[in-house]
């Protein structure tokens, strides 16, 4: 039994590290391995992760982790029983993935904009809390090429456009994703998509 | 809830023993290193001992060493102090505390007082 | 050992004002710790890896310093601030304390 392809780790700066990797065949990740995993720390200890299958040789591991700083280093030990497969480390601040937003919605009801809002997915206490910005993408259901993006680059979770950027009649769907520069993060996963029907007053014409 | 509950202390001559007790709930005790710490009455903490989660790494301070014994058993979420040769300057309340990775105590009991004196 | 020396011992001062706590370290450290105690009352923890304010430790707190100095600030005091600040550091065994700086209403 070897490693493929060495394990990959993102952290969500909160509470779990993902961990994953690929071995050279099929493999039952829950029953022949477990990912050992430790802060570089006086007296710390040592955590086990039972991984699950990605795939029929993939595997992926959610370690939990009680917060992160940014001077956490952690070491990483795969196992098969007894003997180890590979031995790295994990540096959760330099690679962040963060958490997606949640609870999108569009009120529709502001006259003849469009507001878009949605949750920050972390605490206050959180150090990411204050240094997400957004990217939030809204298409046509019935037309493929009418598809955009919006960056949102201040902090406040909401976006205001005008209905008549969108055409009138149709249904479209929204989604927000984040990530935050201070740390170089990767952008998050998106978030669940919203669905609204866009319709607007058109302006009387002048001949 | 997190809860840490020491039992044990009480009064003592100089050169005798006691076996303080700190009974563990609201989380898995078999993950946590912990430790005893404890403080002479009006005086400033001072750290006594640590016992990894698996027993395998044991700490003591140099004031206690070879005279006290910390021990647990994961499967009654105990963790215990056997203290023996007691002097006068052994005299505190006893707190047990959970360790953190990072480094510090993130859970403390109430306290168990332990006073030696003839 | 490491040993912590704090001071002032005591710190009189009126709610509104800027407490400053200090921990001499007699050798360098990697991060220092500090916990709040309360009469009658166990320690809690207040700030870990020096600067990190733990779980509902309002914002007025922080912390700062570097090898052998290091400061817990409190912006504005509040009345439940009053209480002695004892900092710890976890770099070498035995884990010692500094024999804390009470904080009390002028």
């Known amino acids: 039994m070897k490693v493929l392809q060495e394990p990959t780790c993102v952290s969500d700066y909160m509470s779990i590290s993902t961990c994953e990797w690929k071995m050279n065949g099929p493999t039952n990740c829950s029953t022949e391995l477990r990912l050992l995993y430790q802060l570089v720390f006086l007296l710390s200890e040592a955590h086990t992760c039972i991984p699950e299958n990605n795939g029929g040789a993939g595997c992926v591991c959610h370690l939990l982790m009680d917060d992160v700083v940014s001077a956490d280093n952690y070491t990483l030990d795969l196992w098969a029983g007894q003997q180890l497969l590979w031995k790295g480390s994990f540096k959760p601040s330099e690679h962040v993935k963060p958490r997606a937003p949640g609870n999108l919605t569009v009120h529709t009801n502001v006259s003849d904009t469009l507001l878009l809002t949605w949750s920050n997915p972390y605490p206050p206490d959180n150090y990411l809390y204050n240094h997400l910005t957004y990217a939030v993408n809204i298409w046509s259901e019935n037309d493929p090429a009418d598809f955009r993006i919006y960056n949102v680059t201040y902090l406040e979770p909401s976006l205001r456009i005008a209905a008549s950027t969108l055409k009138s009649g149709i249904s479209y769907r929204a989604r927000v994703r984040a990530w935050a520069q201070c740390y170089n993060t990767t952008w998050s996963e998106w978030s669940p998509s919203t669905k609204w029907h866009n319709s607007y007053r058109e302006p009387f014409e002048q001949h | 809830e997190v809860q840490l509950v020491e039992s044990g202390g009480g009064l003592v001559q100089p050169g005798g023993s006691l076996r303080l007790s700190c009974a563990a709930s609201g989380f898995t005790f078999s993950d946590y290193g912990i430790h005893w710490v404890r403080q002479a009455p009006g005086k400033g903490l001072e750290w006594v001992s640590y016992?990894?989660?698996?027993?395998?790494?044991?700490h003591y301070a140099d004031t206690v060493k070879g005279r006290f014994t910390i021990s647990r058993d994961n499967a009654k979420n105990s963790l215990y102090l056997q203290m023996n040769s007691l002097r006068a300057e052994d005299t505190a309340v006893y707190y047990c505390a959970r360790g953190r990775d990072r480094g510090y105590f993130d859970y403390w009991g109430q306290g168990t007082l332990v006073t030696v004196s003839s | 050992e490491i040993v912590l020396t704090q001071s002032p011992a005591t710190l009189s001062l009126s709610p509104g004002e800027r407490a400053t706590l200090s921990c001499s370290a007699s050798s360098s450290v990697s991060y220092m710790y500090w916990y709040q105690q309360k009469p009658g009352q166990a320690p809690r923890p207040w700030i870990y890896l020096t600067s990190n304010l733990a779980s509902g430790v309002p914002a007025r707190f922080s912390g700062s310093g570097s090898g052998t100095d290091f400061t817990l600030t409190i912006s504005s005091l509040e009345p439940e601030d009053f209480a002695v600040y004892y900092c710890?550091?976890?770099?070498?065994?035995?884990?010692?304390f500094g024999q804390g700086t009470k904080v009390e209403i002028k």
């Open positions: 710890q550091q976890w770099t070498s065994i035995p884990f010692t």
């Open positions: 016992i990894r989660s698996d027993s395998s790494i044991i």
